[in-house]
C-alpha cells in the first residue's frame, strides 16, 4: 500500500463582503499554534452555513490564507491573525491557497505527499487521447488501402 | 471526527457545588473553541459558558456570572465547568460542545450553530 499522494496547488485571490454575522468561517494555526507540522501558516478549519464565505463559495476548509487586504499572515500569534480578520473592515480581500488532493497508486492510502507533485491524471489523460487518435488514423489509414 | 463525554452531573442540594468535565477525542483538542450549554425540560438549549484554544479568553451567561467558571487542560484533552452557589433554576442536562478553531467574526456564542461536535450531556439537579 504504498500509492503517492499528490497536490495540485493553486492561488487565488478572493474578495469578500463582510454579512450580517460577519465572514462567515474559522481559523486554527498561526506561531502557538501549529496546526499543519512545520507551517505556522494560517488555514480555514470551518465554514458556517449561509455566511458571507459560503454564500460566495469559492473558500473552503483547508484553505491556506496568504493575506488579507495585502497583509502577510506569516509569523503571526493564533489571536493576532483573529484580530486582523475582525478588524478587516466591510470589503475583504484574500489571497488564498487551495490544495486539491489527488490519489495516486492503491486506493486507501493516504500518507503525506510531495505538494508540488504532478497529478498523474494529467499526464495519462493527453497520452489516452493520442493513443485514440494514433488508433482512428491507423484504422482510416487501413480502409483506404 | 470528534468524540465529547461529559461526567460529573448529579443531584445537589441549593448553595452546593458540582464540577463537570468533559473528555475529548483528536489530537487537535487545542485548536477547539470549547463551550457548555444546557437545557431544561421544555426549554430551549440555552449558551452557558465558552472557552476559547489556550484558555485565554472566556466568556458567560449572565446567569451563571460570578457562579461558573470554565477552565480547560489541553494536555489531558479536557474542559471543565466549576458550578459554585447552585439554584433550582439551574438543574439542567449539560452538554459540552465543541467548534474546530477561532471564528473570525465578532462572537455569537449563544449560537448553538456555531459548534460542529456535541455530547450526550449529563443531568444535573439542584434541589
Known amino acids: 500500500m504504498n500509492g503517492r499522494v499528490d497536490y495540485l496547488v493553486t492561488e487565488e485571490e478572493i474578495n469578500l463582503t463582510r454579512g450580517p454575522s460577519g465572514l462567515g468561517f474559522n481559523i486554527v494555526g498561526g506561531t502557538d499554534q501549529q496546526y499543519v507540522s512545520n507551517d505556522s501558516g494560517i488555514y480555514v478549519s470551518r465554514i458556517k452555513e449561509n455566511g458571507a464565505a459560503a454564500l460566495d463559495g469559492r473558500l473552503q476548509e483547508g484553505d491556506k490564507i496568504l493575506s488579507v487586504n495585502g497583509q502577510d499572515l506569516k509569523n503571526l500569534l493564533h489571536q493576532d491573525a483573529v484580530d486582523l480578520f475582525r478588524n478587516a473592515g466591510y470589503a475583504v480581500s484574500l489571497r488564498v491557497q487551495h490544495r486539491l488532493q489527488v490519489q495516486n497508486g492503491p486506493i486507501g492510502h493516504r500518507g503525506e505527499g510531495d505538494p508540488s507533485g504532478i497529478p498523474i491524471f494529467m499526464v495519462l489523460v493527453p497520452v489516452f487521447a493520442l493513443t485514440m487518435v494514433a488508433a482512428w488514423a491507423f484504422m482510416r489509414y487501413r480502409q483506404q488501402l | 471526527q470528534v468524540q465529547l463525554v461529559e461526567s460529573g452531573g448529579g443531584l445537589v442540594q441549593a448553595g452546593g457545588s458540582l464540577r463537570l468535565s468533559c473528555a475529548a477525542s483528536?489530537?487537535?483538542?487545542?485548536?477547539?473553541?470549547m463551550a457548555w450549554f444546557r437545557q431544561a425540560p421544555g426549554k430551549e438549549r440555552e449558551f452557558v459558558a465558552d472557552i476559547n484554544w489556550n484558555g485565554g479568553s472566556t466568556y458567560y451567561a449572565d446567569s451563571v456570572k460570578g457562579r461558573f467558571t470554565i477552565s480547560r487542560d489541553n494536555a489531558k484533552n479536557t474542559v471543565y465547568l466549576q458550578m459554585n452557589s447552585l439554584k433550582p433554576e439551574d438543574t439542567a442536562v449539560y452538554y459540552c460542545?465543541?467548534?474546530?478553531?477561532?471564528?473570525?467574526?465578532?462572537?455569537?456564542?449563544?449560537?448553538?450553530?456555531?459548534?460542529?461536535?456535541w455530547g450526550q450531556g449529563t443531568q444535573v439537579t439542584v434541589s
Open positions: 483528536g489530537r487537535t483538542f487545542s485548536t477547539y473553541t
Open positions: 460542545a465543541a467548534a474546530i478553531g477561532s471564528t473570525v467574526d465578532s462572537y455569537y456564542h449563544s449560537d448553538p450553530l456555531e459548534y460542529d461536535y
